[in-house]
Structure formats: C-alpha cells, structure tokens
C-alpha cells in the first residue's frame, strides 16, 4: 500500500524549492526499480516528484490566500514490467498560513455624523478591518483596535471597532474631527501587522445658540416720497448655529406710530425694515422703534439657550423731498353751453406746494387750442364751442412750482359741452320719388323721416307740413305719422308726363326744441309711364338707364 504522512507546505517560502514530503509504496525496497509519477492540477508546475524516491517538492512560491489546498494524484510503476505497483491514489497538500497579510479596512473612507453636545458613550460608528490570513491558524487574523488619533474626544472598543464619544464637543468650536484607528493582528503581540484607517467625524448642529443683533443701534433714513412697502434698510443678527438652527424671525417690539414693519429675508437671514404707512417730513421727521429677533425652530429641550430674545433700537430719519404741487382734487369736471362766446368762464382748478416754502404755482394746459388757463387756475374758452363737433373735452392741466420748474403735477379735467337747440331737423336721407301717370288720388308715394344733430334732453319730436304755396295748389298732400315719420300721398287722379314730368314739393320739418327750429326740405317726384299694374319699377329702370347715358325704346 501507499505510505505517506499528511502534507503541509508553508506559504511564501523564499527558497527556490521546498521539500514537502515523501510518497512511497511499501513494496519499494530502494533498488530504483519503481518510478513515481505526480498528476493533477499543479503537478509539474507547482509540485514535482523525484521519480526514483517519491520525494515531493514545491517548485514555486505559494500563497495560501490565493489557494490553500492542492489535490493531486500519485502513481507508482514497476520499470521492469511497466505495470502499476499500487492503484492510483489521491492525496492533499495543504498550504499552511503565515502572518503575511495586514488588516485592511475595506469599507473606507469612513465618515460619520453625530450631534454636537452628545453625551459620553454615544455610539459614533463601527469600523471593521479584514485580515486575509487564516482565522483558524493561531492569531494571524485575530485583531485588536486602538485609537492613534482622536483622544480625548473619542474611544474605540478594542475587539469590536466601535467608536464612541468620550467627551462632549461643541460644533461652534470645532465642527469636524479626524480619528485614526489602527487594527493589529496577532492580538497585538510582537510581529503583528497593522493597518490604519481615517474616520472623518462631523458634528451636526443643535440649536444651542440664540441669534444676537450685531448692533445695538441702527440708523436708517427714509424719503418722505417713499411709497408704502418700501424697504428702508436691513438689520442683521448673527447665530453661531447653522442651517435650520440659524433661521431667524425679526419682529417689531415697539412702534407707537405703527408706521413700520419688519419682514425676514429667509435666504440672507436679514431683517428688512418696511414702510407700512407713508411718512411726511412736514408732519414728523424722525421715529424710534425697537426690533427683536428669535430663532424660527427651537426644540423644547433647548429652550434654556433661548431665554430673552435679543433686541436692537432703530432710529429712522425722514428725509425732506421737494414734492410736486398738490391739486385739491384728483380730477375736475366742468360744464359749459355750446355757442358761448370766446373767453367764457369754464371753471377753476387749484394746486398748492406741500413743502414748507410754499412756492407759487403756474398752470398750463397741455395741447389745447380751445381752452386757456391763467395763473389763478381759471379756465376760459378761446373759441366758441360746438357740441355737435365735440361734446366732451379731456384736458391735462399741469401745475408747476415757480421756484423749481421740475416739480410738476398733472391732473385730468373733463369739460362737458352742453347742448342748445341750434340745429333744425332735416331729411334723414336724400329722397327721389315716382308717381304713375295713371295714379289715383290718395296713393302713397313716399315715407320720409328726419334727423336732428342736436342732443335731445328727453326725445326728439318732429312736425311735418307742406309749405304754404304747396298746401294751396298741391297735387300732393302730407300726413304726419306722429313717430318722426310722414307719408306723401297723391292729392289728385292722373298725371301727364309730357306736361309735368317732375314735381318739387317743399316740406317743412320743425323740432320740439325751445325755441323750435324749422327747415325746408325739397322732395323730387318723377312722373312715370307705368304699365297696367301701376308699378313704378320700369320708371325707376328708365331713369337709371338715362342717367347712365342709354336710350330706351
């Protein structure tokens, strides 16, 4: 049978080759008649066998961490017969461990965040090193952790690598710490290998600082011309905390005049002093207010740091501004009848200088040929007005300070031109009428209507009549419909185209104005040769052709 002991070969041997052990058959009497052979992965490259003796050698440096076990096969042949002396056998060569690997922190970089002011014993982070050596081979992979840097604020548990706080820390003094942890194998004994890692420990902020004003007194100025909502200046408090813990709210603590407000710019953490009501230098030229500042978020357990809010005094000086003239009214509406003579009085506007010096005022009208204004603000006409051309005038009146012509104010002035009855009614359109030669008496020739350019206070009412001469000898008559229309009717039977081809009828139209106005309007009536149906259409057609230069048969 085969004879061998268990085979071990140390890793990382520096020798060119290493005797591992001997394989032999118990039938081998040492006369060199047997030949030993090695087969399997590593045979001939990692391990060789002395064919005569069965001695096995490792011919290359081995690394247990790469491969810890080789399974090989052995054969032994009788040289004289060429036959196997023993059945082929499998055997194992184990690579024994040496402490050739230092502990390594595979999860680095390490970074941890812990709240400032955390009590002693607070867990920060656990660091873990790995050692590639054999954990079952002595202490080659048994690790001990120690702190190389980080005392007195931190400690590390030797066997677990758990880092804890050992002293309270204030982020406002130092916000991060570099801790260096060493891991040693061989449980720290001589010949141990070591590895280190750095842990960045950042302190997160807690709200242990209240905001405090940078200044105990702020001096601000505001122009009396500033509109409400104007930002007149900023005040600033500082808070040693950061982020949400440094967010602050500013507010007014004292402002008897209730003229100012403070809003908080949450981006810059500044307090913005805002004008709540307009100020007037001539009325009050300085103010004093008190502001306070508090954190936006305060945890109950941190209230002890936030007793008594920080306050500051703000002195606000009002700056005098040369203000433009001020009209008594924001706008004026005046009325004047049309047809009044040039130079007629329209109305009076009035503006004053609101400043203390009370500059005299000059007035002017922007782009107007119809009105004039004097230095007293009296508006007069420069022309007679016609309501039927323009019923309203929109004027822009400008007041200018005599002492400072750049100080100007303008207001609108509306002038309504009032109606007088200065227009008689007229035909609403040009009428051309036709009558057949064979027309009977009482036949309607034309319906007419009238218009009046005057404005009617209630409603226009027109009265229609024939002129006196037409009434006495007319072939036609008129009926007033009492609805501002009238009809023209024939007053006889039969007309003669050859004798009287055209009639001109004078129609009087009167309005209901005071005094009443009457106009004379002429209606032209053509006599036509009509067909049996009595239609004037052909007559109208013939008229059209003649007017266009055609002759009809």
């Amino acid at each position: 049978g085969w004879v061998w002991n268990q085979f071990f070969v140390p890793e990382e041997m520096n020798t060119t080759s290493h005797h591992v052990g001997r394989l032999r058959s118990d039938l081998d009497n040492g006369n060199n008649s047997f030949q030993y052979k090695l087969l399997g992965a590593g045979a001939g490259s990692t391990f060789i066998i002395d064919e005569r003796t069965g001695d096995i050698y490792a011919i290359e440096k081995l690394d247990r961490e790469e491969r810890s076990l080789y399974i090989l096969r052995a054969q032994v042949i009788d040289i004289t017969t060429g036959r196997a002396v023993e059945p082929e056998s499998e055997f194992v060569i184990k690579v024994s461990d040496i402490n050739d690997n230092e502990p390594k922190f595979l999860d680095e970089p390490y970074e941890a965040i812990v709240p400032e002011m955390s009590p002693e014993g607070t867990l920060v982070i656990q660091v873990t090193a790995s050692d590639a050596d054999d954990p079952s081979s002595g202490n080659n992979a048994r690790l001990l952790y120690s702190l190389l840097q980080g005392q007195p604020y931190f400690s590390v548990e030797p066997t677990t690598g758990v880092i804890r706080i050992s002293s309270k820390m204030d982020r406002e003094l130092q916000d991060e710490y570099w801790v260096i942890i060493q891991a040693k194998d061989m449980i720290g004994q001589p010949g141990a290998l070591s590895g280190t890692t750095s842990v960045l420990i950042k302190l997160s902020d807690v709200n242990d600082n209240k905001p405090i004003f940078k200044e105990s007194l702020y001096r601000l100025t505001v122009s009396e011309s500033a509109p409400t909502g104007t930002s007149i200046g900023t005040i600033m408090a500082y808070d040693n905390d950061i982020g949400e813990n440094a967010e602050m709210d500013y507010s007014i603590e004292e402002d008897d005049s209730q003229t100012f407000d403070i809003i908080t710019n949450h981006e810059t953490q500044e307090g913005i002093v805002i004008l709540k009501k307009k100020v007037n230098f001539e009325h009050q030229n300085h103010y004093g207010i008190r502001a306070k500042v508090k954190n936006h978020h305060v945890d109950k357990q941190l209230m002890k740091y936030h007793t008594e809010a920080s306050t500051t005094f703000i002195k606000i000086q009002v700056e005098d501004v040369d203000e433009p003239p001020l009209f008594l009214l924001p706008y004026y509406i005046f009325e004047i009848f049309e047809e009044t003579p040039q130079g007629s009085f329209v109305g009076v506007v009035s503006a004053t200088d609101p400043d203390n010096r009370k500059s005299p005022i000059r007035y002017s009208i922007t782009r107007s040929k119809v009105f004039n204004i004097d230095d007293n603000g009296t508006i007069t006409t420069t022309n007679s007005l016609d309501r039927e051309i323009s019923a309203w005038y929109n004027l822009s009146i400008t007041a200018t300070e005599k002492y400072n012509i750049e100080q100007i104010s303008s207001i609108p002035v509306y002038v309504q031109v009032l109606n007088i009855n200065d227009h008689a009614p007229e035909f609403s359109q040009y009428y051309e009428s036709y009558v057949c030669e064979n027309a009977g008496s009482g036949q309607v020739i034309q319906t007419i209507s009238a218009v009046d350019r005057d404005e009617s206070i209630e409603e226009h009412h027109f009265y229609f009549n024939l002129s006196v001469e037409d009434t006495n000898s007319s072939s036609f008559t008129i009926i007033d419909n009492q609805d501002n229309t009238a009809v023209i009717l024939t007053n006889r039977t039969g007309f003669n185209l050859q004798e009287e081809p055209i009639f001109y009828i004078s129609i009087l139209i009167a309005d209901n104005g005071i005094p009443s106005l009457t106009s004379t309007n002429t209606l032209t009536i053509h006599v036509c040769d009509c067909d049996d149906s009595g239609s004037t259409q052909t007559c109208q057609y013939q008229e059209l052709m003649l007017s266009m230069g055609f002759k009809t048969e």
Partner: antibody, heavy 121, light 107 residues
C-alpha cells in the same frame, strides 16, 4: 544521451536584439527546468534566467530583467532567450543548462557548449 | 541576494596531493549547494549537488561536505585531469549565484 546545442549568437550593436536557441535531446524536455548561464571573457559564471518545466514559472537576474525573455517550446524541445536593448556588458558566452530532479530541480546537471554574443559598435 | 565567496582564489598543488576548496554563503542555504568544474574552452561540468551528492560519473576521490554557510570540496588525491577552475553555486534562493571560482594548478 542528454545533449544541448546553443545557437543564435553573433555580433550586435548596443541597443540591438538577438534571439538565442537551445535545442535539447535525450530527455523529456517538459519535465525539467532549463537555465541560461553566461560567462564574460576571462570572468566567472553568472546565472541569467530559469524557466520551469512546462514554462509556468520564469526567473531573471536583476541585470537582465525587463530586457531578456526566457521561453520554451515543448513540441520542439527548444529553449529560447530573447535579448533586447543589448549593452556591452552583455558580451559573453551563453550556455544553456538542464535542471535536475527532485531537490535539484532548479540545478544545472548538463550544460551546452555555449554560443558567443558580442555587443559592440 | 546570496553572496558566495570561494577561497583560495588559486591553489597550487602537486599530483597525488589532497585539495581542499572552501565556499562560504552570506546566509544559510541549507544543503542546496552545487560544485562545478570548468576547463579552458569547455562548458562547466556538475560534480556535486545537495552539498555532498556526487553527480553521475564523478569519481569517489571527489567529495563534498558542509551545510548552512560553510562548504568544502575535497579531492583526496589530485590527478592530472583535476587541474581546472572550480565554482560553487547556491540554488536555495533566487537569484541563483555562483562563487568567484578557485583555480587548482600544478605546483
């Protein structure tokens, strides 16, 4: 009978290249380590390089590392030495030598007669 | 690297005399030492390996001894064919290194 026959030597300029061969016979080539050893004129022996049987492992003297490459072709039972960036100090007779058995695996039990390499401008 | 130091550099002896050649290693190389003989114009020839094992065909008058750092090659009775240069070589560590050689000449 084990025999080793070197070839490929010659005169080469500094910076040049040469490839030496060593034809082996009389033994199972793939079962033995093979070596190159050189001897400068009038000097002692200097080991150059070794390759294990089958070519899995190669080793070099510091003086040639990065410039010389040892290799073998088991099918031809031939050992090679590719020499690049040659220097005057590389001038020598280059011998190939067969490794031994067992504990003398990386030994030199049979030597070839050598081939001469001259590096000169 | 292991430095091999041979002494003496030259050994002048007569035929039939005993030759004792020394080889020292700069650190222990166990028994992984070989001795070679080289004659002018010839390739080296293996004499001893494993510090004391004679190679095939080497006569019994040639013997080796020692281990660790101190080694000796002994030729008990010099023959004419023994006059040559002798090199020791360690094969325990990379790089393999040779001694500077000892020349055995006829007195």
């Amino acid at each position: 009978e084990v025999q080793l026959l070197e070839s490929g030597g010659g005169l080469v300029q500094p910076g040049g290249s040469l490839r030496l061969s060593c034809a082996a016979s009389g033994f199972t080539f793939s079962s033995y380590a093979m070596n190159w050893v050189r001897q400068a004129p009038g000097k002692g022996l200097e080991w150059v390089s070794t390759i294990s049987g089958g070519g899995a492992n190669t080793y070099y003297a510091d003086s040639v590392k990065g410039r010389f490459t040892i290799s073998s072709d088991n099918s031809k039972s031939t050992l090679y030495l590719q020499m690049n960036s040659l220097r005057a100090a590389d001038t020598a007779v280059y011998h190939c030598a067969k490794g031994g058995m067992g504990g003398y695996y990386y030994g030199m039990d049979v030597w070839g007669q050598g081939t001469t390499v001259t590096v000169s401008s | 690297e292991i430095v091999m130091t041979q002494s003496p550099v030259t050994l002048s002896l007569s035929l039939g005399e005993r030759a004792t050649l020394s080889c020292r290693a700069s650190q222990s190389i166990s028994s992984n030492l070989a001795w070679f003989q080289q004659k002018p114009g010839q390739a080296p020839r293996l004499l001893i390996y494993g510090a004391f094992t004679r190679a095939t065909g080497i006569p019994a008058r040639v013997s080796g001894s020692g281990s660790g750092t101190e080694f000796t090659l002994t030729i008990s009775s010099l023959q004419s064919e023994d006059f040559a240069v002798y090199y020791c070589q360690q094969y325990n560590y990379w790089p393999l290194t040779f001694g500077g050689g000892t020349k055995v000449e006829i007195k």
